[in-house]
């Protein structure tokens, strides 16, 4: 490498991960680096070792900008077999946490095939069930094939997973078994000499589960109390365990101490240490500490020990002495700081009387008071009483809590109509919201209108999300405002406030909301304020009841923001089923500025036509259809018939005279007169009555003698009657004929 | 190699007592407890009682009344007495090492209770 | 007591099938430190009750992974793989959990 380029890592001389050499060769490696490292060597190479020599780092490579050191073994021996590194030294501008370089070193020895021989005494290797154990019968060359038995007659055979060889390391067992416990030995033949290391794994059966320390830490105690701490220790079945104490008073022997065994769990131990001090003092305050040993494991567990002298109470507001909730929450605490020794009683009071009397969602919980599922009935004066009657210490606090409640709407929770009310075009109507809320909620009036638009068939457009207004009584929006007015009244016992909007006149339909707000929240009530022109909304009528051969003309309005789909049908009854005709020819509806109208005409009838005719409009609201009936009786045809024949009749020259032609007939007939068989026609002086029935001549002259007759005529024929009038105080030349 | 051996009288009369060794090899009674089992004719295993590595004795209830287990352990023996013997209690009887199961048991010994 | 229950009773299986061994326990094995004890063992005919497996799932050395273990709580199954003539005896369940263990009363291994 050039000056130029960094070594991250030392470099070593002999490349690679191991290097195998012949035991009495000189091992020689050369370390080289960007600054001063040092060596690490295997535990078997002693430092002191005089065939070992090791240069101190020196400068080196282009420039002298490297460091450079070496590590020279004369005579190596299989024993020197390891793990050999160079690393930079730690106080060395390189942070790199593994800036190190490492080979294993192999010094093969025929005639010592294993690092360690262990013939006569076996090796204690200790092994956990379930850990992995390795039988350390590691080897000069990484040729030597090693053989794992277990005595006497078991061979454990590799499989590249639950047992594995590693020259370096030995046997691998990934899962120890008890089946692994006894005598095992590593075997290798090298020159057909059979060589023998030997190892007995020793169960460690030192498992410590748990340790624990009853009471819980801190524990506090007044002078002159007992102290009793239990330590329990947990280990698995087979497991012996020492337990000691450390404390402040140890070296005076302060506290008695007893152990036993629970052996009532099947499946493990459970070992007690019970530390006991009677009549505390000052100087037994401090840390206990158990200490739990087996084998090589240990655990212990610490607790606190406080003494005071005396009991005391110190109570503070946890939060403000004024605290505030909301109706509706499932729970609320109201909390106090206390400091106190021994435990007070404690008892809550609620306005003066004990709280947890008043109501079973009152529950104590150390220094607090749960109120379960908030209502406004909570809010009120709160307060702890704390006792300690030994010390004759009392206190007490009170904390204010209000109950704040959301903006309610009575009208809303009053069960709707299925479909809203509609208020007649002109009327004066009175809308009113009934409020509750805790902060007194703010009211206001808001107007949303519906754009007009004949074409449509109904205000379908006119929805809470169009854009809305706020409302007071000077607003020229919508209709006119008589008044916006608000009162307080009690109802069932809590204040109310009623706000109310008198509309002067009804013209204009649209959505009156009103809208209660306060810092809890917001609520509003919409009133679809629907206009009408007609009676409920729905009428029907009938013309007249007509004649066979008449016209039958029906109509029927409904208000177009509560109906739509109008139809005419004609109800008939078969076998006790009624039956529901529609009728062809129906007149394209009609729409209004507040209704939509269908007239049927059905154009010479006949008796087949009579019976039940009925409008149909679905409701917009209810999807409900709705009919509204009628009763159409065709009446049978019938000829003319005179009520009373025309008689002859005298008359004053200029006075007048009526000539009345009664006539009755199906249809009703049509009255013709005639005078000397000419018709007449209304005429001055000639005035023809109601349906002609009537004649009424003014002044009479004497042009106006002669043969009156009338005809009544329908299709079923006709009937007539004749007179003379006669006119008195004629001409003479009248006289002389 | 971790052995157990149990020995007794093949035969006990009603009432008397039963007395069975159990004798240890490969593990010591002060590392190991151990338990004894028994399986009656056509019915599967009953524990009887654990001796554990300490001394300590823990018993099946309904056979209390009946049992005492205790140990030798410079013999590496465990016994067990049973009285008051009826012929429902006739059956195998093994003594088995206790390391959270019965990792080891004995091959049995066989007792018949009958007059 | 817990009392174990075992299903089937016996069973009749070809060379080379699988079967299932169900142990059912009247009440949760689960212990206090959260460990379940629950073990099986086989009986090969004239010889002494054998460990298969602990702890519900642990199999012990030497046991081959035919065997296999499963279940939680008070429903525990023992699973064989490849049946071979070996394996023929009768295989219990047992609970070291609560005092006294108890055992299931077995089931029947037989060889078609």
């Known amino acids: 490498y050039g000056s130029g380029s960094k070594l991250k890592v030392p470099e070593l001389s002999l490349k690679g991960t191991q290097h195998v050499m012949q035991a009495g060769q000189t091992l020689f490696l050369k370390c080289r680096g960007e600054a001063a490292h040092s060596w690490s060597l295997p535990t078997t190479v002693s430092q002191e070792d005089k065939r070992l020599s090791i240069t101190p780092p020196s400068a080196c490579g282009r420039d002298n900008r490297q460091f450079c050191s070496t590590l020279t073994l004369d005579t190596a021996q299989a024993n020197h077999t390891g793990l050999y590194t160079c690393r930079y030294l730690p106080t060395s501008t390189s942070k790199k946490k593994k800036a190190e370089s490492s080979i294993y070193i192999f010094v093969s020895d025929a005639g010592s095939p294993f690092i360690e021989m262990h013939t006569d005494i076996p090796k204690l290797v200790h092994m956990t069930e379930g850990r992995q154990l390795i039988i350390p019968c590691r080897v000069t060359s990484p040729n030597v094939t090693v053989t794992l038995k277990k005595f006497p007659f078991d061979t454990l055979t590799p499989d590249g997973q639950r047992i594995t060889w590693d020259s370096r390391r030995g046997f691998i067992i990934a899962n120890a078994t008890y089946k692994e416990i006894g005598l095992l030995n590593c075997e290798a033949t090298v020159n057909g000499h059979l060589y023998q290391t030997n190892y007995l794994t020793h169960r460690q059966t030192n498992t410590i589960l748990d340790v624990q320390i009853r009471p819980p830490s801190p524990v506090r105690l007044l002078h002159g109390q007992t102290l009793v701490l239990n330590c329990t220790a947990t280990t698995e079945l087979n497991t012996r365990v020492q337990m000691s104490w450390n404390y402040p008073g140890k070296a005076t022997k302060r506290a008695s101490i007893r152990q036993r065994i629970d052996r009532s769990h099947s499946h493990n131990n459970v070992f007690h240490s019970v530390l006991k001090i009677n009549n505390v003092e000052s100087r037994d305050k401090g840390l206990y500490t158990c200490r739990v040993k087996s084998g090589s494991s240990f655990q212990s567990f610490n607790t606190s020990v406080h003494v005071y002298e005396k009991g005391f109470i110190s109570v503070k507001h946890r939060k403000q002495p004024v605290q505030e909730t909301t109706a509706g929450r499932r729970s609320y605490r109201l909390s106090m700081k206390v400091k106190a020794f021994p435990s007070p009683e404690i008892v809550w009071l609620k306005d003066g009387s004990p709280a947890t009397l008043k109501s079973a969602r009152y529950l104590v919980h150390g220094y607090s008071l749960i109120i379960k599922d908030v209502t406004t009935e909570d809010a009120g004066d709160y307060t702890i009483l704390l006792g300690i009657k030994q010390s004759r210490l009392f206190k007490n606090l009170t904390a204010t809590l209000i109950v704040n409640v959301k903006p309610q709407i009575y009208e809303k929770s009053v069960s709707s109509l299925p479909s809203p009310p509609l208020y007649p075009l002109g009327s004066r109507q009175v809308l009113t919201c009934t409020v509750y809320g805790i902060p007194r909620p703010t009211i206001t009036w808001l107007w949303h209108p519906c754009h007009h638009n004949h074409s449509k068939e109904r205000y379908d457009f006119c929805t809470e999300n169009e854009e809305s207004f706020i409302l007071d009584p000077s607003s020229n929006l919508g209709n006119r405002i008589e008044s916006i007015s608000q009162r307080m009244t009690v109802i069932e016992g809590t204040n109310k406030t009623v706000s109310t909007l008198v509309v002067a006149d009804s013209q204009t339909p649209g959505i009156y909301s009103c809208r209660a707000f306060n810092k809890i929240g917001t609520v509003e009530r919409n009133i679809k304020f629907y206009v009408t022109d007609v009676p409920n909304g729905f009428h029907v009528s009938l013309e007249k009841m007509p004649a066979e051969g008449e016209d039958l003309k029906l109509s029927c309005v409904v208000n177009k923001f509560l109906y739509r789909d109008i139809t005419w049908i004609l109800l008939r009854t078969v076998n006790n089923r009624t039956m529901h005709h529609s009728i062809s020819k129906q007149k394209m509806a009609t729409t209004q500025d507040y209704s939509i109208t269908l007239n049927l005409v059905i154009k010479n009838v006949s008796l087949e036509d009579s019976g039940t005719y009925a409008c149909r409009a679905r409701n917009i609201y209810t999807g409900e259809d709705i009919l509204r009936k009628t009763e159409v009786l065709v009446r049978d045809s019938e000829a003319p018939h005179l009520l009373q024949n025309l008689s002859d009749y005298e008359v004053s020259i200029s006075g007048s005279t009526t000539l009345d032609c009664q006539a009755r007939g199906v249809p009703a007939p049509q009255i013709t007169w005639f005078k000397n068989n000419h018709k007449i026609q209304q005429e001055p002086g000639i005035i023809l009555g109601p349906g002609n029935s009537t004649l009424f001549i003014e002044r009479v002259t004497e042009e106006d003698e002669g043969v009156y007759r009338c005809r009544a005529t329908n299709q079923k024929g006709a009937v007539e009657s004749a007179a003379y009038l006669t006119v008195q105080g004629t001409s003479d030349k009248s006289n002389l004929e | 190699q971790v052995q157990l051996k149990e020995s007794g009288p093949g035969l006990v009369r009603p009432s008397e007592t039963l007395s069975l060794t159990c004798t240890v090899s490969?593990?010591?009674?002060?590392?190991?407890?151990l338990s004894w089992v028994r399986r009656p004719s056509g019915k599967g295993p009953e524990w009887l009682c654990r001796?554990?590595?300490?001394?300590?004795?823990t018993y099946n209830s309904a056979f209390k009344s009946r049992l005492t287990i205790s140990r030798d352990t410079s013999k590496d023996q465990v016994f067990l007495k049973m009285n008051s013997l009826q012929t429902d209690d006739t059956g195998t009887y093994y003594c088995?090492?206790?390391?959270?199961?019965?990792?080891?048991w004995g091959q049995g010994v066989m007792v018949t209770v009958s007059s | 007591d817990i009392v174990m229950t075992q299903t089937p009773v016996s069973m009749s299986v070809s060379l080379g099938g699988q079967v299932s061994i169900s142990c059912r326990s009247s009440q949760s094995l689960v212990n206090n430190n959260g460990n379940t004890y629950l073990s099986w063992y086989i009986q090969k005919p004239s010889q002494s009750p054998q460990l298969l497996i602990y702890k519900v799932s642990n199999r012990v050395s030497g046991i081959s992974d035919r065997f296999s273990g499963s279940g939680s709580g008070t429903d525990f199954t023992l699973k064989i793989n490849k049946i071979e003539p070996d394996d023929l005896g009768v295989y219990y369940c047992g609970q070291n959990t609560q005092y006294p263990l108890t055992f299931g009363s077995g089931t029947k291994l037989e060889i078609k």
């Open positions: 001796l554990w590595f300490d001394g300590d004795t």
């Open positions: 490969g593990f010591s009674l002060s590392d190991y407890s």
């Open positions: 088995t090492r206790d390391d959270r199961d019965f990792d080891y």
